[in-house]
Interface confidence: low
């Protein structure tokens, strides 16, 4: 059965938007006015995985692109990457674990925890124009809280 998906944008808790930086990287920076059109639109798919009231498994694809955020080990460190997939087979209900994030809602903010690497979160830096990455700390310097904006299909 078709996976259920919605289109959205994400901003970190400092209101930085996410934009493409080269073909396989996202960066976070403040955007205003017409520049807001640069922000990436995600296709968030609700996929199979452990689920509770405040934790929902999702996959984050780039709308109308065959690219998904995925979590892999690079030099023994959990790393966030944009991975190219076969568009005929994705998205699907049973996504491989590296594509799955636990969307956790706390106080109207969202965290995205890697299902593959528990306690590692999609993160942005305090600094402007830096890559979006997978971070192993919460509540520190790096930002792990996001808000989601619904985009009509």
């Amino acid at each position: 059965a078709p996976v259920r998906s919605l289109n959205c944008t994400l901003r970190d808790s400092q209101q930085k938007s996410l934009v493409m930086s080269g073909p396989y990287e996202l960066k976070a920076l403040h955007l205003q006015g017409q520049d807001m059109e640069q922000q990436v639109v995600f296709s968030m798919s609700f996929v199979q995985g452990e689920e509770s009231n405040d934790k929902i498994p999702v996959a984050l694809g780039l709308k109308e692109k065959n690219l998904y955020l995925s979590c892999v080990l690079k030099d023994d460190k959990p790393t966030l990457q944009l991975e190219s997939v076969d568009p005929k087979n994705y998205p699907k209900k049973k996504m491989e674990k590296r594509f799955v994030f636990n969307k956790i809602e706390i106080n109207n903010k969202l965290e995205f925890e890697s299902a593959q690497f528990p306690n590692w979160y999609i993160s942005t830096s305090q600094a402007e124009n830096m890559p979006v990455f997978l971070g192993g700390t919460k509540g520190g310097q790096d930002i792990t809280d996001f808000t989601m904006q619904f985009v009509s299909s």
Epitope: A1, C8, E51, F150
Partner: antibody, heavy 125, light 112 residues
Framework: EVQLVQSGAEVKKPGASVKVSCKAS????????MHWVRQAPGQGLEWMGL????????IYAEKFQGRVTITADTSTDTAYMELSSLRSEDTAVYYC??????????????????WGQGTLVTVSS | NFMLTQPHSVSESPGKTVTIPCTAS????????VQWYQQRPGSAPTTVIY?????PSGVPDRVSGSIDSSSNSASLTISGLKTEDEADYYC???????????FGGGTKLIVL
């Protein structure tokens, strides 16, 4: 045109089993979950469970767990609901219903967009 | 367990407005969409509202749905009541915590 056509009425004795069919047409059978809902005489709607025809995955309401089996045959685009150990309280109209997923900012849900005509199952000694 | 509670029956005169509430027993009603079905005697249910407030084509705009988070309830409102509105109405939602579908007990609408 989407259609869900169910099998005819059944009369069963207590302790027996019943298998109701639901033949789908007018859409891609594997692209939509199929649910079963029943309604006892003069009572409300009661959800029983679902099948994902694509992979046969099922989810059942706790009340029916162990007594209901929902299956899908993709070669004939037909879903089935089998209820065993029948008792008089199982006398009801049984509906199959196709589900449309709806998703939005606040959450998601099921929306039953097409229903079968219903199959009356009477359990009587 | 997630439950939806509806009044057993409501009655109103033709031309008036009626509101049928549907209250969630636990969790937030806003977390998952609420649907409303109309069922006339001897017929299968048909959808009159989906996604809290959306009307399928063919359903008149005098039928509307809403969510009130403060009372943790959904409501179906029918204005300009007609005798053909007399039917049973069921609310329904999806409990994402345990992947189950829940129906309210149903409300008989009597148009006096």
């Amino acid at each position: 045109e989407v259609q869900l056509v169910q099998s005819g009425a059944e009369v069963k004795k207590p302790g027996a089993s019943v298998k109701v069919s639901c033949k789908a047409s007018g859409y891609t059978f594997t692209s939509y979950y199929m649910h079963w809902v029943r309604q006892a005489p003069g009572q409300g709607l009661e959800w029983m469970g679902l099948v994902d025809p694509e992979d046969g995955e099922t989810i059942y309401a706790e009340k029916f767990q162990g007594r209901v089996t929902i299956t899908a045959d993709t070669s004939t685009d037909t879903a089935y609901m089998e209820l065993s150990s029948l008792r008089s309280e199982d006398t009801a109209v049984y509906y199959c219903a196709r589900v449309e997923w709806v998703a939005g900012t606040e959450g998601w849900g099921y929306y039953f967009d097409y229903w079968g005509q219903g199959t009356l199952v009477t359990v009587s000694s | 367990n997630f439950m939806l509670t509806q009044p057993h029956s409501v009655s109103e005169s033709p031309g008036k407005t009626v509101t049928i509430p549907c209250t969630a027993s636990s969790g937030s009603i806003a977390n998952n969409f609420v649907q409303w079905y109309q069922q006339r005697p001897g017929s299968a249910p048909t959808t009159v509202i989906y996604e809290d407030s959306q009307r399928p084509s063919g359903v008149p705009d005098r039928v509307s749905g809403s969510i009130d988070s403060s009372s943790n309830s959904a409501s179906l409102t029918i204005s300009g009541l007609k005798t053909e509105d007399e039917a049973d109405y069921y609310c329904q939602s999806y409990d994402s915590a345990n992947d189950r579908v829940t129906f309210g007990g149903g409300t008989k609408l009597i148009v006096l």
